[in-house]
């Protein structure tokens, strides 16, 4: 039998990019560190 | 609110051709993910999917009757239509539309059915 | 075509009494992108069929939660857990992955 016609199965979950700065001190300037949100 | 209804001419002829027409509100068939089915039941037995239309104008028909069957929709009127060729008595019953989405994807919508009786 | 098989066709119960369908595909109903699309609905007399479940075991937006689905495959049960008269009707099974989608012949809940 042919299928019906249906979405992907796939959920869409959009991935959070969260940014954050930590001071090291004045010689070093400031890393900047980058956490991505995996697929819940 | 989402509403459905079905009409159609209540009694017809052997051989004759079967029109009916779904009207809605509350959704537009011109509305990516919308799609409109046709499901009919003799009295006192059970449930039959006929065919089915999308959005986009893609079509389901059951094999069974395809040869008989045509389904089609005016967005602008917001109606869906279904035709019957050469009816029988086999096709008495009461037909009822229904909306499924891609999101809402289950008939969670139906009209109240109009009933066809076919008889010489 | 698959063929969704009901059992019991009639099943007499007194009111506060669990209550257990059984649906049972000729094919597996998984589609091709992961999902079973099986659903469960109620019609009562004189009346269109309603919603209960939908893919198995997805409860529809005011369905008491006495109502319950479950299964894989080719086999699928609709459980009600304190049966109320509300519930009494026909409940029927359906399978929306293949074409045709198709119903099964249905389930008489009716009072002892």
């Known amino acids: 039998d042919a299928e019906f016609r249906h979405d992907s199965g796939y959920e869409v979950h959009h991935q959070k990019l969260v940014f954050f700065a930590e001071d090291v001190g004045s010689n070093k300037g400031a890393i900047i560190g980058l956490m991505v949100g995996g697929v819940v | 609110q989402v509403t459905l209804k079905e009409s159609g001419p209540g009694i017809l002829k052997p051989s004759q051709t079967l029109s009916l027409t779904c009207s809605f509100s509350g959704f537009s068939l011109s509305t990516s993910g919308m799609s409109v089915g046709w499901i009919r039941q003799p009295s006192g037995k059970g449930l039959e999917w006929l065919a089915h239309i999308w959005w986009d104008d893609d079509k389901y028909y059951n094999p069974s009757l395809k040869s008989r069957l045509t389904i089609s929709k005016d967005t602008s009127r917001n109606q869906v239509f279904l035709k019957i060729t050469s009816v029988d008595t086999a096709d008495t019953a009461t037909y009822y539309c229904a909306r499924r989405t891609t999101t809402a994807d289950y008939f969670a919508y139906w009209g109240q059915g109009t009933t066809l009786t076919v008889s010489s | 075509d698959v063929l969704m098989t009901q059992t019991p066709l009639s099943l007499p119960v007194s009111l506060g009494d669990q209550a257990s369908i059984s649906c049972r595909s000729s094919?597996?109903?998984?589609?091709?992108?992961?999902?079973?699309?099986l659903e469960w609905y109620l019609q009562k007399p004189g009346q269109s069929p309603k919603l209960l479940i939908y893919k198995v075991s997805n409860r529809f937006s005011g369905v008491p939660d006495r109502f319950s689905g479950s299964g894989s495959g080719t086999d699928f049960t609709l459980k009600i857990s304190r049966v109320e008269a509300e519930d009494l009707g026909i409940y029927y099974c359906?399978?929306?992955?293949?074409?045709?989608?198709?119903f099964g012949a249905g389930t008489k809940l009716e009072l002892k």
């Open positions: 359906f399978q929306s992955s293949h074409v045709p989608l198709t």
């Open positions: 094919q597996s109903i998984v589609h091709s992108n992961g999902n079973t699309y």
